[in-house]
């Protein structure tokens, strides 16, 4: 359905408010260092132009593609070369190469100041003074820090952000009302960003086929009563939506996501019995609700998979005639029967099945060759089950903070070349799997844990890709998307690592640690732990525990002292000396 003017088409479909918000997100995700006011100016110019095209689709430049229009607009920024360096070279290219160039320069870890939350009264005043600017600023700050944030979902977050201020700025105790809501939005937002980053990495690094396989498995678990053809249609549409968002085509993405939600709700009888409530909500809530909807009940009396995929004499014929369709059917049938498996496990099983058919359907006795293929699945299923059991036991024994510390030590020994902030961030997030998933019953643990770990390890992969320092990380990140977690799990201590030179400054602490939040204080201690392991990778658990216990006691003691700074200086020296002796540094 070609439109004379793409920009007019999207403006009319989305409405002015969403159009402006999405253009702002797109621009902030591309030019992450530009000041807010510059972006607002660009967005207003694009919006005014879009309105002229709505009035007359034949007007000058209205027939240009959105990439051309947006790219031309971004390339008018005067300080492009000074602020972004080689990204300015993108502007010398023609579309579609120019957009690809902008995409390649998206920075997962931009050098931006941490967002500091002002006092509640200050925020409420700003909200009341200029609600529109306040909400735009939210979109801008999130988008520039999370250049792959799922744009239509960010609109949903902004709606909730607005609702929180609307309600809480009138409350008797504004802070008690607002702060928990903002904490929840922040945590959910980080999780949403990380989940979407994995989808984009899947599409960009491993291709559409990998993403479609993931989607078949996930949607088949969620909608086990839906026919394969229905699931396939949803997968195709969902792939288009995410391809667009990951490619910076945010207007098309939001528009297509709305169409997909509409389709799902119009056809919920043939998709899932769990959609009713979602489909009664307004658009943004509806789309979010559908994306998070619980798995439908599995149909009763599903036949054994072996009949069609092992015992049938037509296995190789069906496979050879349409490989991806046949493998898709296998994945669909397996996934709908196994909501208790992680998506990545299901994909490993499908890969094993594919590899077996590739081999056996060229063998002299194909049936004898693939007859035992399901037996090969057993160790693949048991590996994550055992790992989750062990780690949940460890988590329950240690609690979240100490479990994170155990993972910090484990991962620093595996990949000590990785930067300390990255190791701390990733290990802390890996450690959160405990409180997130270990509370679940057995049937929900694996999908919760392993699919969450895939998201966290992808953070490590994208951060490492920016400045690669470890061949082992590169290998685990690039060889196989579904085997990343087993690859990292299998890494042993890096025996080639030359321990870091001891630097007393790294272990010097000041009184400012006492005023930090509990979370920030933990991060300081965990940073020290990583550095300790980098200095002494062969240190035992017991040695490290002793040093960390001494460190905790030292912080607690000095934070209670009258002259905190002197205490930190004097006791700190003693602690460093004692630690060096304990670890033999």
């Amino acid at each position: 359905d070609a439109h004379k003017s793409e920009v007019a088409h999207r403006f009319k479909d989305l409405g002015e408010e969403n159009f402006k918000a999405l253009v702002l997100i797109a621009f902030a995700q591309y030019l992450q260092q530009c000041p807010f006011e510059d972006h607002v100016k660009l967005v207003n110019e694009v919006t005014e132009f879009a309105k002229t095209c709505v009035a007359d689709e034949s007007a000058e430049n209205c027939d240009k593609s959105l990439h051309t229009l947006f790219g031309d607009k971004l390339c008018t920024v005067a300080t492009l070369r000074e602020t972004y360096g080689e990204m300015a070279d993108c502007c010398a290219k023609q579309e579609p190469e120019r957009n690809e160039c902008f995409l390649q320069h998206k920075d997962d870890n931009p050098n931006l100041p941490r967002l500091v939350r002002p006092e509640v009264d200050v925020m409420c005043t700003a909200f009341h003074d200029n609600e529109e600017t306040f909400l735009k600023k939210y979109l801008y700050e999130i988008a520039r820090r999370h250049p792959y944030f799922y744009a239509p979902e960010l609109l949903f977050f902004a709606k909730r952000y607005k609702a929180a201020f609307t309600e809480c700025c009138q409350a008797a105790d504004k802070a008690a009302c607002l702060l928990p809501k903002l904490d929840e939005l922040r945590d959910e937002g980080k999780a949403s960003s990380a989940k979407q980053r994995l989808k984009c990495a899947s599409l960009q690094k491993f291709g559409e086929r990998a993403f479609k396989a993931w989607a078949v498995a996930r949607l088949s678990q969620r909608f086990p009563k839906a026919e394969f053809a229905e699931v396939s249609k949803l997968v195709t549409d969902l792939t288009k939506v995410h391809t667009e968002c990951c490619h910076g085509d945010l207007l098309e993405c939001a528009d297509d996501r709305a169409d997909l939600a509409k389709y799902i709700c119009e056809n919920q009888d043939s998709i899932s019995s769990k959609l009713k409530e979602c489909c009664e909500k307004p658009l943004l809530e509806k789309s979010h609700c559908i994306a998070e909807v619980e798995n439908d009940e599995m149909p009763a009396d599903l036949p054994s998979l072996a009949a069609d995929f092992v015992e049938s004499k037509d296995v190789c014929k069906n496979y050879a005639e349409a490989k991806d369709v046949f493998l898709g059917m296998f994945l669909y049938e397996y996934a709908r029967r196994h909501p208790d498996y992680s998506v990545v496990l299901l994909l490993r099983l499908a890969k094993t099945y594919e590899t077996t058919l590739e081999k056996c359907c060229a063998a002299a006795d194909p049936h004898e060759c693939y007859a035992k293929v399901f037996d090969e699945f057993k160790p693949l299923v048991e590996e994550p089950q055992n790992l989750i059991k062990q780690n949940c036991e460890l988590f329950e024994q240690l609690g979240e903070y100490k479990f994170q510390n155990a993972l910090l030590v484990r991962y620093t020994k595996k990949v000590p070349q990785v930067s300390t902030p990255t190791l701390v961030e990733v290990s802390r997030n890996l450690g959160k799997v405990g409180s997130k998933c270990c509370k679940h019953p057995e049937a929900k643990r694996m999908p919760c844990a392993e699919d969450y770990l895939s998201v966290v390890l992808n953070q490590l992969c994208v951060l490492h890709e920016k400045t690669p320092v470890s061949d082992r990380v590169t290998k685990c990140c690039t060889e196989s998307l579904v085997n990343r977690r087993p690859c990292f799990s299998a890494l042993e201590v890096d025996e080639t690592y030359v321990p870091k030179e001891f630097n007393a400054e790294t272990f010097t602490f000041h009184a400012d640690i006492c005023t930090l939040s509990e979370k920030e204080r933990q991060i300081k201690k965990q940073t020290a732990l990583v550095e300790l392991v980098k200095h002494k990778p062969k240190a035992t658990k017991e040695q490290l525990k002793a040093v960390m216990d001494d460190f905790a006691a030292f912080v607690e003691k000095c934070c209670k002292a009258d002259d905190k700074e002197t205490c930190f200086a004097e006791e700190g020296k003693k602690l460093v000396a004692a630690s060096q002796a304990a670890l033999g540094l």
């Epitope: 004499k313 190789c316 014929k317 496979y319 050879a320 590739e358 081999k359 359907c361 060229a362 063998a363 002299a364 006795d365 194909p366 004898e368 060759c369």
Partner: antibody, heavy 118, light 106 residues
Framework: QVQLQQSGAELVRPGSSVKISCKAS????????MNWVKQRPGQGLEWIGQ????????YYNGRFKGKATLTADKSPTTAYMQLSSLTSEDSAVYVC???????????WGQGTTLTVSS | QIVLTQSPAIMSASPGEKVTMTCSAS?????MHWYQQKSGTSPKRWIY???KLASGVPVRFSGSGSGTSYSLTIRSMEAEDAATYYC?????????FGAGTKLELK
């Protein structure tokens, strides 16, 4: 491009053994069956057996069990066929061929002529 | 094992003539493949999976069949088509070849 390069012609005594090689290049050697085919002068083709270098699995034509032994080495990407207790009946051209899905042989070696004579 | 009987054993055809050779299996097979062999060279895959032409094979060739009866057809004989053609079955162990049909130019 895919190539299968076989070892040179062999003249051997009855009762002895011989090992013929087939060096593969231009494709993922581990992921395809390597088949061996016998052709006696002026006669048809006879399938001997196949080996999957990825894991060493083999299938043999019952007529050649005990006569032929198939092996493969992944590092020089080479398949081997050892023929034992040779008689004049084993004099033939032996060809290696790559097997693909649904059992056809898409690439063939140039053949190795084996002559068993006293 | 499945026995493949090719007929005729030898045939000749003039340029431009239509040629059909058959391959009959002693019991049903899943797929049939055909190879062309010229004197002093190794066989070449010619038709595979019953009806697909191998790379570089002229479109005047075609393959068809199912069950126990298969055939290779040349729509219009050309001099370069003179060779021996072997059928090979897949679907039953051991893999077997027919004795060949020798096609000569008249």
């Amino acid at each position: 491009q895919v190539q299968l390069q076989q070892s040179g012609a062999e003249l051997v005594r009855p009762g002895s053994s011989v090992k013929i090689s087939c060096k593969a290049s231009g494709y993922a050697f581990s992921n395809y069956w390597m088949n061996w085919v016998k052709q006696r002068p002026g006669q048809g083709l006879e399938w001997i057996g196949q080996i999957y270098p990825g894991d060493g699995d083999t299938y043999y034509n019952g007529r050649f069990k005990g006569k032929a032994t198939l092996t493969a080495d992944k590092s020089p990407t080479t398949a081997y066929m050892q023929l034992s207790s040779l008689t004049s009946e084993d004099s033939a051209v032996y060809v290696c061929a790559r097997g693909v899905i649904l059992g056809s042989f898409d690439y063939w070696g140039q053949g190795t002529t084996l002559t068993v004579s006293s | 094992q499945i026995v493949l009987t090719q007929s005729p054993a030898i045939m000749s055809a003039s340029p431009g003539e239509k040629v059909t050779m058959t391959c009959s299996a002693s019991s049903s097979v899943s797929y049939m493949h055909w190879y062309q062999q010229k004197s002093g060279t190794s066989p070449k895959r010619w038709i595979y999976d019953t009806s697909k032409l191998a790379s570089g094979v002229p479109v005047r060739f075609s393959g068809s069949g199912s069950g126990t009866s298969y055939s290779l057809t040349i729509r219009s004989m050309e001099a370069e088509d003179a060779a021996t053609y072997y059928c090979q079955q897949w679907g039953s162990n051991p893999l077997t070849f027919g004795a060949g049909t020798k096609l000569e130019l008249k």
